[in-house]
Amino acid sequence: MSGLGRSRRGGRSRVDQEERFPQGLWTGVAMRSCPEEQYWDPLLGTCMSCKTICNHQSQRTCAAFCRSLSCRKEQGKFYDHLLRDCISCASICGQHPKQCAYFCENKLRSPVNLPPELRRQRSGEVENNSDNSGRYQGLEHRGSEASPALPGLKLSADQVALVYST
């Protein structure tokens, strides 16, 4: 962890600051094991929710989580954690896991005759237990979505219940 938090003589630009972490901030992950949905931030000295960096870069430490997050946003797909891939429900109906139930069963019962609000509910069933940030609805909104998770300390709803397709 040399260089972190240590000052040097002379001015330092942001470029210099980034040179202190040549492969990016997250090379320090090996120093700490964080839950799968989190990464170690060596400047904050704590594990942070991967959700906070999914839009910015695909770091190895958060790659699987960020893929699963974007996969869940696609209708008719689910994230297979064993294959580490986004799978189309259409290709496995008949032998489908529960994550595809809404899709495969709706294929059998065409939703054309359903009222629009029911149609939306059915097609969005996988997302229904969470808001856009992946936080379970019904849980009290505790702090911001980026809230750090020091094991044994307070947990935001993100850390308590990050929506994972299992």
Partner: antibody
């Protein structure tokens, strides 16, 4: 409940050394860093240094290099700040804080006087 | 070293007033890889230790009232208190996480 507990006050003779303690409860110090900060009315807040209790690595602000030594005992969940060759300049409040500054001890008032 | 300059050094306000505190850094605090600004805001009341209000320049810490808002990027940062309450009277410090330096503080007083 998460807390960082510090001794309230220390009175030490000039030239001597002192070891201030910071005991964490409610979390394991191995999961974060522990920083030490000095606060003097005229100088404001000065970062002394930090320790990574998981591996014992410590880092210091240049000003405190040689003056301060930060250690940690994970078995007692405690971090320490040792200050050597004390002078009146060292008379002030010292805080310990966790990780990104979410939790702070109540501060130890150090008085260096003969 | 990274120098943080806070202004004003003190500010007399009326209860219910909107307050804006400034913090300028001698170098950019934006880490481009994750687009986070490594700047925090702390509150210190007389005889007490510091309380974290904001980190990553704009992320409110757990339990902090939403009248406190952090904004800015790069070198210019602001802490806004939308409607000052009596309990907000304190000294406010900005701090950067690269080398852990603090600003000189802004003292918020009653007018």
């Amino acid at each position: 409940e998460v807390q960082l507990q510090q001794s309230v006050a220390e009175l030490v003779r000039p030239g001597a050394s002192v070891k201030l303690s910071c005991t964490a409860s409610g979390f394991n110090i191995k999961n974060t860093y522990i920083h030490w900060v000095k606060q003097r009315p005229e100088q404001g807040l000065e970062w002394i240094g930090k320790i990574d209790p998981a591996n014992g690595n410590s880092e210091y602000a240049p000003k405190f290099q040689g003056k301060a030594t930060i250690t940690a005992d994970t078995s007692s969940n405690t971090a320490y700040l040792q200050l050597s060759s004390l002078t009146s300049e060292d008379t002030t409040i010292y805080y310990c804080t966790s990780g990104y500054g979410a939790y702070w001890g109540q501060g130890t008032t150090l008085t260096v006087s003969s | 070293d990274i120098v943080l300059s806070q202004s004003p050094s003190s500010l007399a306000v009326s209860i219910g007033e909107k307050v804006t505190l400034s913090c300028k850094s001698s170098q950019s605090l934006l880490y481009s890889s994750n687009q986070k600004n490594y700047l925090a805001w702390f509150q210190q009341k007389p005889g007490q230790s510091l309380k974290l209000l904001i980190y990553w320049a704009s992320t409110r810490e757990f339990g902090v009232p939403d009248r406190f808002t952090g904004s800015g990027s790069g070198t210019d940062f602001t802490l806004t208190i939308s409607s000052v309450k009596t309990e907000d009277l304190a000294v406010y410090y900005c701090q950067q996480y690269y080398t852990w330096t603090f600003g000189g503080g802004t003292k918020l007083e009653i007018k």
